[in-house]
Amino acid sequence: SERCDDWGLDTMRQIQVFEDEPARIKCPLFEHFLKFNYSTAHSAGLTLIWYWTRQDRDLEEPINFRLPENRISKEKDVLWFRPTLLNDTGNYTCMLRNTTYCSKVAFPLEVVQKDSCFNSPMKLPVHKLYIEYGIQRITCPNVDGYFPSSVKPTITWYMGCYKIQNFNNVIPEGMNLSFLIALISNNGNYTCVVTYPENGRTFHLTRTLTVKVVGSPKNAVPPVIHSPNDHVVYEKEPGEELLIPCTVYFSFLMDSRNEVWWTIDGKKPDDITIDVTINESISHSRTEDETRTQILSIKKVTSEDLKRSYVCHARSAKGEVAKAAKVKQKVPAPRYTVELACGFGAT
């Protein structure tokens, strides 16, 4: 066959759908690879062709669009399953071509099973709610285009395995689920089941997402440096190891970049000649507040090093702070035995 621009297997778009449910899959060419849409391509005389490779097979085969009840069909740039079966899993290719032009891309489709509590291998989207922030909503995702606006589906919401009804704090409102005041106990998986009729048949769409309650911007503060502080003095003798932890608390802030760094005499450690190492560890609270610790280490400190200024800096979207460590050279302990000997010798 003549040359075709092959975009390969687009593993970034690993599509997962539930068994025995409708699925509509748009050809990724128009969404991610080509600069024109399906309508433009169609008007220019280009044809969209679909084929697939079954799981654990190498053979490309055409998709059978003549199944009973049109189980698989194509509409414009969308491949429809009404509904899916487990053995529909495989790599699907959409190819756009005419006599002079050809472009194609493949993508994996995985049909997954769910249990009665909606547990499955499906990767779940995460929706973050601010703790105690007032009314917040989540919306049943990825149901657009499955039925016309004239069809009024029924929507049932579940938290984990349990139907949400007569709850005080979580209120189903059609496609939306409202949280009056989000608390830690709101964390968990929420499922909407959308039921709609089509051509005398009833279809179900199951969509599960994870709700994660995070720190509220109302309570967010600039970074807080817990260490170094005024209560701890790093007193060392030359030749000893100097270890100074910089421990900083960051309030959760959506899309904020949290940074911690040391300066030594006003310069970044990379820009000075002393042998210094920095080790960082990060921990998170359950509301995704962050604590970063950077330990500055000088294996064998010199008396010059003990005169330097060691400053820990921290920055987030809420502001920037800095704190100097109190470093000093230990005064050698008096050598009492010698002094006593001298004292006795004088008497």
Epitope: I131, E132, Y133, M159, G160, Y162, F167, N168, N169, V170, F179, I181, L183, I184, S185, N186, N187, G188, S216, K218, N219, V221, S285, R286, T287, D289
Partner: antibody, heavy 117, light 110 residues
Framework: SLEESGGRLVTPGTPLTLTCTVS????????MIWVRQAPGKGLEWIGF??????TWYASWVNGRFTISKTSSTTVDLKITSPTTEDTATYFC??????????????WGQGTLVTVSS | DVVMTQTPASVSEPVGGTVTIKCQAS??????LAWYQQKPGQPPKLLIY???TLASGVPSRFSGSGSGTEFTLTISGVQSADAATYYC????????????FGGGSEVVVK
């Protein structure tokens, strides 16, 4: 640590404020509850205050108790009009902030309130 | 509010025996359940949260199970130090800040 204070002998109808003072952590990062225990009886949950200040009360409270954060280290429980049935040891407890469940892992020793005429 | 019902009110068991305490919620509370131990003159001590997770420092002879409305605390190989009153607590019914306790179960170790 947590320490409750303000418990004393009061006559019925005299408002009383109990204070829970925390040290070693900030209330801006923790939820708290107040619980009481009448002599020889079980634990009875009164109310909850979230780290953002939102409050929830047991249905029997009916406005007789008010919980508020008065500083970064103190939470108050106000008994608006005590009756003899409010005689109990009052505990405050802190949520540990380490799991996807509220976990009240740190408790004060309690303060005794006696309501008597 | 959700109501927590604990049984039995009192149980007596010889050292080395197994104690089982039940807690029933009037409505589904998922896994939002904690168990506490209280000895006379002391505040409660957290034993288990999330229905089955042992709190830090709690001996492994304590275990919790259940979800929804039925929960169990089991002490396997009970010791004399385990003589106390045990309470279950709902830790966030209906995803609200509602935290009622059960009526308590006294454990006597013979």
């Amino acid at each position: 640590s947590l320490e409750e204070s303000g418990g004393r002998l009061v006559t019925p109808g005299t408002p009383l404020t109990l204070t829970c003072t925390v040290s070693g952590f900030s209330l801006s990062r923790c939820a708290m509850i107040w619980v009481r225990q009448a002599p020889g009886k079980g634990l009875e949950w009164i109310g909850f205050i979230g780290r953002g200040g939102s409050t929830w009360y047991a249905s029997w409270v009916n406005g007789r108790f008010t919980i508020s954060k008065t500083s970064s280290t103190t939470v108050d429980l106000k008994i608006t009009s005590p009756t003899t049935e409010d005689t109990a040891t009052y505990f405050c407890a802190r949520d540990g902030d380490y799991s996807d469940y509220y976990t009240f892992d740190l408790w004060g020793q309690g303060t005794l309130v006696t309501v008597s005429s | 509010d959700v109501v927590m019902t604990q049984t039995p009110a009192s149980v007596s068991e010889p050292v080395g025996g197994t104690v089982t305490i039940k807690c029933q919620a009037s409505q589904n509370i998922g896994s939002n359940l904690a168990w506490y131990q209280q000895k006379p003159g002391q505040p409660p001590k957290l034993l288990i949260y999330g229905a089955s997770t042992l709190a830090s420092g709690v001996p492994s002879r304590f275990s919790g199970s259940g979800s929804g409305t039925e929960f169990t605390l089991t002490i396997s190989g009970v010791q004399s130090a385990d003589a106390a009153t045990y309470y279950c607590q709902c830790s966030g019914y209906d995803t609200t800040g509602v935290f009622p306790f059960g009526g308590g179960s006294e454990v006597v170790v013979k």
